[in-house]
């Protein structure tokens, strides 16, 4: 049975949060760099796998927790290692914008899970 109990954030809520933290922002988390990820390989866990390494950045904590809740709901979420580009680092804001673009596409096509 899924944990946590409280319903996971909806895709719409995730989009709203991603918009909130990227609008009018040239940078996030003091320009911290993270590994680029392939979002098609399970977008929540893939994004989390990269973003979880960002600390001391309150701006993305809510996003991290939303991704964690969504990733936690996936079957065997903790066991799947998402495909990661270990040779490419990008700024946090770029990864968040990539995620926003991808999530919006998923939302438009109605493939929420």
């Amino acid at each position: 049975s899924p944990s946590p109990v409280t319903p996971s954030p909806t895709l719409k809520e995730l989009i709203e949060e991603l918009v909130n933290i990227t609008q009018n922002q040239a940078s996030l988390c003091n320009g911290s760099m993270v590994w680029s990820v392939n979002l098609t390989a399970g977008m929540y866990c893939a994004a989390l796998e990269s973003l979880i390494n960002v600390s001391d950045c309150s701006a993305i904590q809510r996003t991290q927790r939303m991704l964690k809740a969504l990733c936690s709901q996936k079957p065997a979420a903790g066991q799947i290692s998402s495909e990661r580009s270990r040779d490419t680092k990008i700024e946090v804001i770029q990864l968040v914008k990539n995620l926003l673009t991808y999530v919006r596409g998923v939302y438009r096509h109605g493939n929420f899970r």
């Epitope: 946590p4 979880i52 600390s55 809510r62 991290q64 927790r65 964690k68 809740a69 936690s72 979420a77």
Partner: antibody
């Protein structure tokens, strides 16, 4: 600096309920969630859940879904945990905490509130 | 839920020794493990986050390592004030879960 001050010890009867408070200071209350953790008889720690004061959103550990309700009062920068249908198994020390540096890693803790359930 | 196993409930040590406390996760938690120290009657104190990052003010004889499923907290040059309970936490997945704890005591 970040401080969390919890309410005092409670002695309650089985079946009763109790409300534990956690008053925060030293940071912007809506910036970080308040986490609640239980420790029974000096044993290990169990995560109960968290509440995000920014929007009131909560996430609970399934084991506590019928046991705890988390709320906040933004005006006083205080978080509350309401425990209900208490049994002797719920006798424990309950902690509130915040995570500032790393998401979900609680580095600032209240002093703990002892709840004893006894007839 | 992810289970964290701290196989040694007690560990005996002497002042000046080096000791390694282990924590094994039931599934891959990447590097999302933290370590806490707790002394009797006190609240837990966070030592390490994301497997190897020390919190400000934590002495550098505390070192965290590991990734995936196997994690270690190493205390080199153990001091008497290090005698305490140590808990690991996984913060990869909800619900957050703790290990059962390892009590570090004097031989």
């Amino acid at each position: 600096q970040v401080q969390l001050k919890q309410s005092g010890p409670e002695l309650v009867k089985p079946g009763a309920s109790v409300k534990v408070s956690c008053k925060t200071s030293g940071y912007s209350f809506t910036d970080y969630p308040i986490y609640w953790v239980r420790q029974s008889h000096g044993e290990s720690l169990e995560w109960i859940g968290y509440i995000d004061p920014y929007n009131g959103g909560t996430t609970y550990n399934q084991n506590f879904k019928d046991k705890a309700t988390l709320t906040v009062d933004k005006s006083s920068s205080t978080a509350f945990m309401h425990l209900y249908s208490l049994t002797s198994e719920d006798s424990a020390v309950y902690f509130c905490a915040t995570a500032v540096v790393a998401t979900d890693v609680m580095e600032n803790w209240g002093q703990g509130t002892s709840v004893t359930v006894s007839s | 839920d992810i289970v964290l196993t701290q196989s040694q409930k007690f560990m005996s040590t002497s002042v000046g020794d080096r000791v390694s406390i282990t924590c094994k996760a039931s599934q891959n938690v990447r590097n999302a493990v933290a370590w806490f120290q707790q002394k009797p009657g006190q609240s837990p104190k966070a030592l390490i986050y994301l497997a190897s990052n020390r919190y400000t003010g934590v002495p550098d004889h505390f070192t965290g390592s590991g990734s995936g499923t196997d994690f270690t907290l190493t205390i080199s040059n153990v001091q008497s004030e290090d005698l305490a309970d140590y808990f690991c936490l996984q913060h990869w997945n909800y619900p957050l879960t703790f290990g059962a704890g390892t009590k570090l005591e004097l031989k």
